[in-house]
Amino acid sequence: EEELQVIQPEKSVSVAAGESATLNCTATSLIPVGPIQWFRGVGPGRELIYHQKEGHFPRVTPVSDPTKRNNMDFSIRISNITPADAGTYYCVKFRKGSPDVELKSGAGTELSVRAKPSAPVVSGPAVRATAEHTVSFTCESHGFSPRDITLKWFKNGNELSDFQTNVDPAGKSVSYSIRSTARVVLTRRDVHSQVICEVAHVTLQGDPLRGTANLSEAIRVPPFLEFTQQSMRADNQVNVTCQVMKFYPQRLQLTWLENGNVSRTEMASALPENKDGTYNWTSWLLVNVSAHRDDVKLTCQVEHDGQPAVNKSFSVKVSAHPKEQGSNTAAENTGTNERNIYGGSG
């Protein structure tokens, strides 16, 4: 009588998550009488996957009719595979006894599970930064297998090169996660820009997954301030405007001060957007020159997006008021400005 052999023809089987895996096993002899058991792993900690004799294995079914003894086929089908099912499976023949005696094991079939990566999630910096600064964006995707994966970064369709990527864990695992951090230099024109994280994996059939983040969430474009003064009107009133230009986001508060005293405070709202995504806002103040004996120092104070206030000051001369004064002739810009705020009055 030939010696019993347990044959597992496939060294490895790869299955997509959610599908069924067929693990093949045949025996070369019907004897001795005794059950076949399937295990994952080896040694005392091995996990029983299927037992011909007993137990409840709802996801495991024998491929062949178990009541037909002469087929010698002990293959099983495991349904609804998840990454947690990955591992090496062994078909083991036992001789009937008390206890059953292990006779022969197959060589094992490694089951690898192809699991799709989750949709990449891109997160930006917690606080906004201004142009010329570098900000970091992080892209994360989880639950994929096998470990091989490709991640690319794009800004407005142009591939980025300044990024670092890690795939965890480093050793063998049922599934993996990827985390990548890209460094992006902001420009004033980036309000409408977008960064894209693109993940390619064998399970995606060449159709990569993308996660996006808008640079509008990460950028702050501080405003330019400009003063203009219209000609003196017949009623001795001068219309002074403070133009707040090219700022983002819209959150902005403007305060007028006359000789250091608050005259009016306004909040920007529902402003039209410039083509580049920034905003402009013009605020005006009527100054009654005849009510002042001395020159009037006007200050336009702008608080943008919670940043320290920026002031621009302007003096309206009250000595000698020509009736049809041209623009700026009775005014002197005395402001000192920081942060790219233009000096001058018009």
């Epitope: 009588e1 002899s29 019907l30 004897i31 009488v33 005794g34 059950p35 076949i36 011909q52 004799k53 007993e54 178990p66 009541t67 037909k68 003894r69 002469n70 009937k96 006894g97 008390s98 206890p99 059953d100």
Partner: antibody
């Protein structure tokens, strides 16, 4: 339909011989361990003999050397050759199929009566 | 040889009753234990194998349990057709041996 039909029983004198047959249908007899079980009138069940798929044979102590189990694959039949019969061998003899992988009895024939009496 | 002892030898019960028959092996038989039902003048019928697995076509009112040396057969709700003699059998090693039987009678 899976079926076992015994034949060959009858009245025989002590020391005599008898050959029981079991015709199998609906399955290949050679793929299964096959058994003979007997039951004396008003008594319990007693396992008598078995033949494995490899032709290996087994007997209960009281029939060893007197009974021989065999099979004929071409006829899909099982046999029990009974020699040196004794009164204690009087019983209904059942042909039984052993289960797929553990030899648990699953299919029984209707039985054939053997009477050993002078 | 492995001895199989059934208890009780006979049992009276009524229709609708739940009954339990026990079987003890003289040594560990793992769970290679079968139960059979036999009615007068008929061949035995296979009910349970490997202590708790039902043969196909056997109603679920029959259940088996146990491992090692102690085993039970339970019939959850007796019907008239269930009154018969029940046998346990070990088939872990030759010679296979049966219990002496439990006769279940109608009260």
């Amino acid at each position: 339909e899976v079926q076992l039909v015994e034949s060959g029983g009858g009245l025989v004198q002590p020391g005599g011989s008898l050959r029981l047959s079991c015709a199998a249908s609906g399955f290949t007899l050679s793929s299964y361990d096959m058994h003979w079980v007997r039951q004396a009138t008003g008594k319990g069940l007693e396992w008598v003999s078995a033949i494995g798929t490899a032709g290996d044979t087994y007997y209960t102590g009281s029939v060893k050397g007197r009974f021989t189990i065999s099979r004929e694959n071409a006829k899909n039949s099982l046999y029990l050759q009974m020699n040196s019969l004794r009164a204690a061998d009087t019983a209904v003899y059942y042909c039984v199929r052993g289960g797929v992988w553990d030899d648990a009895f699953d299919i029984w024939g209707q039985g054939t009566m053997v009477t050993v009496s002078s | 040889d492995i001895q199989m002892t059934q208890s009780p030898s006979s049992l009276s019960a009524s229709v609708g009753d739940r009954v339990t028959i026990t079987c003890r092996a003289s040594q560990d038989i793992n769970n290679y234990l079968a139960w059979f039902q036999q009615k007068p003048g008929k061949a035995p019928k296979s009910l349970i194998y490997t202590a708790s697995s039902l043969h196909s076509g056997v109603p679920s009112k029959f259940s088996g349990s146990g491992s090692g040396t102690d085993f039970t057969l339970t019939i959850s709700s007796l019907q008239p057709e269930d009154f018969a003699t029940y046998y346990c059998q070990q088939y872990v090693s030759y010679p296979y041996t049966f219990g002496q039987g439990t006769k279940l009678e109608i009260k």
